[in-house]
């Protein structure tokens, strides 16, 4: 019963004469176990008999151990693990066939065939290829042989155009109840120039002898493989010639479908054909050309081929590094003038004129001056004659206004208080000057640009400068204005005494100035409207109070004259013309109220008084006035008073005071 | 008629500092397309240019003696000044200060006008 | 630093032509170079012949000739005299500074 039985097996073993085989083998019965195993050569079933008959190769004991007999069949399994692979080795053709497995339970019997194929020579690996191959497209091949034993070893090597492959193969074998077989894969990057090359699988024995191969012709599609020609076979051609292009194919799978031409990277309108013809080239039709082929692969382009399109100078240009260019910079010309080949001579030319000595692309002034201004051209030359010059190029030369000076307009001299007109005056300039400048910085009025209005001249308007501005200023030299003014500054300086003036001393006023111009001047000195000298110092030589008061000194020039402020001389005195006054008379009646004053005249002023009577018998008062009060008879008499300050002291004459009776007093009597 | 005039100290010690004026007439360092330079020749040597300084302030230095040199000018003057700091022996030579002039209708300068040079000694 | 080479010496004679060289280590010599040269006669008379190359300084006779040959700087004295005997230096710019040559002294033989 088939459904008891489970018995696995590859099915069918190749092999060749003089080989071995190898038969994985292992089973499973569901009931019981395995008690007999008899390996047959073409069982046949005896009907009769209720038997297998056919040549038994191998029969196992009750005891699993191999009987005497058969060497070259091996029964390598065992009932303990369900193995029932066998090998025979070596294996001949006529063992080809089936081999029965017979296998016995308790309960169960059973017979397993597997065909056996021995062939006489070895037969061929079979190689398989990827459905397409496309150039640089990586594929593995594989080379694939049913036959594998451990009994017999063997190597498949590949071979392309009959030389061994360098890439590295990688060899597979299987020896499994499923499949056996060696197989070798090998990684290959098919090119082009693979196309239509037989690849080889070999089947080597183990001294490297071919036992058998199979062979196979690669078709790789590619791209067109393309190579460009010129006729005639110079690519520099003189403008005017014809120049033919050939592309060929030299390879394409499949074949191409279509054409086309490119100039610098542009496809050229209708050129389609594999021969491109350029009549009359002209200098446009320098560049580099290549043919585009396409197949269903894809486009393939050849490589470039640089047509040189030679031609004399064209006219000239030349580009100036900077212009405007300020002076004292670097300026470079260039001549740019499309030449093929390019110039080897240069002449250069300013204003028309032909500058000496410079003859390459390139001239280089490196320090720009005003007069290098103007228009610059060049003229270009090479092999196949002189271009003609441009226009030119103008080059503007920027620089800060030269020679500036600066005029005074004013007839001179110029007194103070004048209205002064100032021209800034300057040779050349570039830009225009826009603007001036003035030092000083005054409130000064510009009638007119470089013209400056000075109003009311200050005597101290010594020097003005004037700068003239475009993008730069230049200063003038700076004008002394030379004003001419009255003296300043007059002043009344005591040179002596250093302290305080007392009556008698020496005295000396110095009469001083800060400045005049011109520098001759004369002195005047004044009290009180009067003249009293004309030398720069007055002196006294004893000092009187009376010459105490305000003085004034003047100075003069050519211009004027300036006084200086009033100075009070101030001279102190000791107490003097001292005298008592009795504001009611000298003659007072008793009862009444006597006052007696004590007048002075000092300087300071009196800060302490005395009074004395007839008998220089001081009384006990101490101000500027003596009150008597009620005044008696008694009082009658001569009186006198001293005044002092921190000069000194003075007294006054004697003044009598009389006293007479009241009425009353002369009735009571 | 253009002139040059150099003057120095004559005689001087290791690391003092070398004062140089060119005094020159005959040509104004405020006009355009001027300069003057400084060259020096040891004695029985070639020249050696130092440093030169042109009308509008651009001023050139040798450029292995640059961190020594100082040039100066006093347009008003008429006068051009180099300062070489820190003397050694090897500054001993004859001074010369030179126009440097790029001449109307010129395109290049030239050293066209030179002094008679002063001599220096730098000595212990 | 670049060096600046001249002959050491050229002998001549009256009414011959002359031509001295300006070498520089950096390289060939250019109009970016600016070449100038310069005499010097007895007694330290220096005088400017030509700045820029080829441009004679005013004033200087026709004779005193720059150009450039190959990759040198050159001077050239054609019809030489008596007077021309002198030491030559040329000065080359370098961007920013000039460098003398050693000079070249040349002898006019009488």
């Known amino acids: 019963d088939s459904s008891k039985w489970n018995i696995e097996h590859p099915g069918t073993i190749y092999a060749w004469e003089g080989a071995c085989v190898w038969v994985p083998c292992t089973y499973r019965v569901l009931d019981g176990a395995l008690e007999t195993f008899i390996l047959f050569h073409n069982p046949e079933y005896n009907q009769n008999m209720s038997k297998f008959e056919g040549t038994r190769l191998y029969e196992s004991t009750k005891d699993g151990k191999l009987p005497s007999g058969q060497k070259r069949v091996q029964f390598l399994g065992n009932k303990i693990n369900n193995n029932c692979t066998l090998s025979i080795h070596p294996v001949h053709v006529n063992d080809s066939g089936q081999l029965g497995l017979r296998m016995v339970s308790k309960t169960e019997k059973w017979m397993e065939r597997i065909h056996l194929n021995v062939s006489e020579r070895p037969f061929p690996p079979r190689i398989q290829l990827p459905p397409k191959l496309q150039e640089s497209q990586e594929v593995t091949l594989t080379c694939l042989l049913n036959f594998s034993c451990y009994g017999y070893q063997i190597q498949l090597q590949w071979l392309l155009e009959g030389v061994p492959m360098r890439q590295a193969a990688v060899t597979l074998t299987s020896l499994s109840t499923k499949s056996v077989f060696t197989r070798s894969e090998l990684k290959f990057s098919p090119q082009w120039s693979h196309h239509g090359k037989i690849v080889t699988c070999e089947l080597h024995d183990v001294d490297g002898k071919v036992l058998s191969e199979d062979m196979v012709q690669l078709n790789v599609k590619h791209t067109p493989k393309l190579t460009i020609e010129v006729t005639p076979n110079e690519t520099t051609v003189r403008k005017g010639d014809s120049v033919t292009m050939t592309c060929k194919v030299n390879s394409s799978n499949p074949e191409y479908t279509t054409v086309s031409w490119l100039k610098d990277g542009i496809p050229l309108k209708e050129q389609n054909t594999l021969m491109l013809t350029l009549h009359k080239v002209t200098k446009s039709q320098s560049g580099r050309y290549c043919c585009r082929v396409s197949n269903d692969v894809g486009p393939a382009t050849s490589e470039k081929v640089f047509l040189q399109v030679q031609y004399a100078p064209e006219s000239s240009r030349v580009q100036i590094s900077q212009s405007p260019a300020v002076e004292g910079s670097e300026v470079n010309f260039l001549c740019i003038s499309p030449a093929n080949p390019l110039p080897t001579n240069y002449t250069w030319y300013h204003n028309g004129k032909e500058v000496q000595g410079r003859t390459e692309k390139q001239f280089q002034i490196q320090k720009i001056l005003p007069w290098h201004a103007g228009t610059y051209s060049c003229e270009a030359e090479n092999i196949l004659g002189i271009g003609e010059r441009g226009p030119g190029t103008e080059l503007d030369v920027q620089y800060p206004p030269k020679k500036v000076t600066m005029v005074i307009e004013n007839p001179t001299p110029i007194r103070e208080g004048d209205t002064v007109t100032l021209s800034c005056n300057y040779s050349s300039s570039n830009p225009i000057v826009n603007h001036y400048e003035w030092r000083p910085r005054g409130a000064w009025e510009e009638p007119s640009l470089g013209v400056l209005k000075i109003q009311n001249i200050g005597w101290n308007n010594t020097a003005v400068a004037c700068a003239a501005c475009n993008n730069w200023c230049s200063w003038a030299s700076p004008v002394t204005l030379n004003v001419l003014y009255a003296p300043r500054g007059v002043r009344v300086r005591k040179i002596k005494p250093l302290s305080e003036i007392h009556s008698g001393n020496s005295v000396s006023l110095q009469c001083d100035f800060s400045s005049s111009h011109p520098k001759e001047v004369q002195f005047f000195w004044e009290k009180n409207g009067s003249l009293l000298g004309k030398e720069s110092q007055l002196n006294f030589d004893s000092i009187s109070p009376e010459d105490a008061g305000s003085y004034s000194c003047w100075v003069n020039n050519s211009i004027g004259q300036t006084a200086s402020k009033a100075w009070t001389l101030e001279v102190l005195y000791a107490p003097r013309r001292l005298r008592v006054s009795m504001s009611q008379g000298n003659q007072v009646m008793e009862g009444k109220t006597a006052t007696l004053i004590c007048e002075s005249d000092a300087n300071p002023p009196v800060y302490s008084y005395a009074w004395f009577d007839w008998n220089n018998q001081s009384l006990p008062y101490s101000g500027r006035m003596l009150r008597l009060e009620p005044v008696k008879v008694q009082h009658s008499g001569a009186y006198w008073c001293q005044g002092t300050n921190r000069v000194g002291k003075g007294h006054s004459p004697l003044i009598t005071l009389t006293v007479y009776y009241s009425p009353q007093t002369i009735g009571r009597r | 008629q253009v002139t040059l005039k150099e003057s120095g100290p004559g005689i001087l010690q290791p690391s003092q500092t070398l004062s140089l004026t060119c005094s020159f007439s005959g040509f104004s360092l405020s006009t355009s397309g001027m300069g003057v330079g400084w060259i020096r020749q040891p004695s029985g040597k070639g020249l050696e240019w130092l440093a030169h300084?042109?009308?509008?302030?651009?001023?050139y230095y040798n450029p292995a003696l640059k961190s020594r040199l100082t040039i100066s000018k006093d347009t008003s003057k008429n006068q051009v000044f180099l300062k070489i700091a820190n003397v050694d022996t090897a500054d001993t030579a004859t001074y010369y200060c030179?126009?440097?002039?790029?001449?109307?209708?010129?395109?290049?300068?030239?050293?066209?006008?030179w002094g008679t040079g002063t001599t220096v000694t730098v000595s212990a | 630093q670049a060096v600046v080479t001249q002959e050491s010496a050229l002998t001549t004679s009256p009414g011959e032509t002359v031509t001295l060289t300006c070498r520089s280590s950096t390289g060939a010599v250019t109009t970016r170079n600016y070449a100038n040269w310069v005499q010097e006669k007895p007694d330290h008379l220096f005088t400017g012949l030509i700045g820029g190359t080829n441009n004679r300084a005013p004033g200087v006779p026709a004779r005193f000739s720059g150009s450039l040959i190959g990759d040198k700087a050159a001077l050239t004295i054609t019809g030489a005299q008596t007077e021309d005997e002198a030491i030559y230096f040329c000065a080359l710019w370098y961007s920013n500074h000039f460098i003398f040559g050693s000079g070249t002294k040349v002898t006019v033989l009488g």
């Open positions: 030179a126009r440097i002039s790029i001449p109307y209708g010129y395109y290049d300068w030239f050293f066209d006008v």
């Open positions: 300084i042109w009308w509008d302030d651009d001023e």
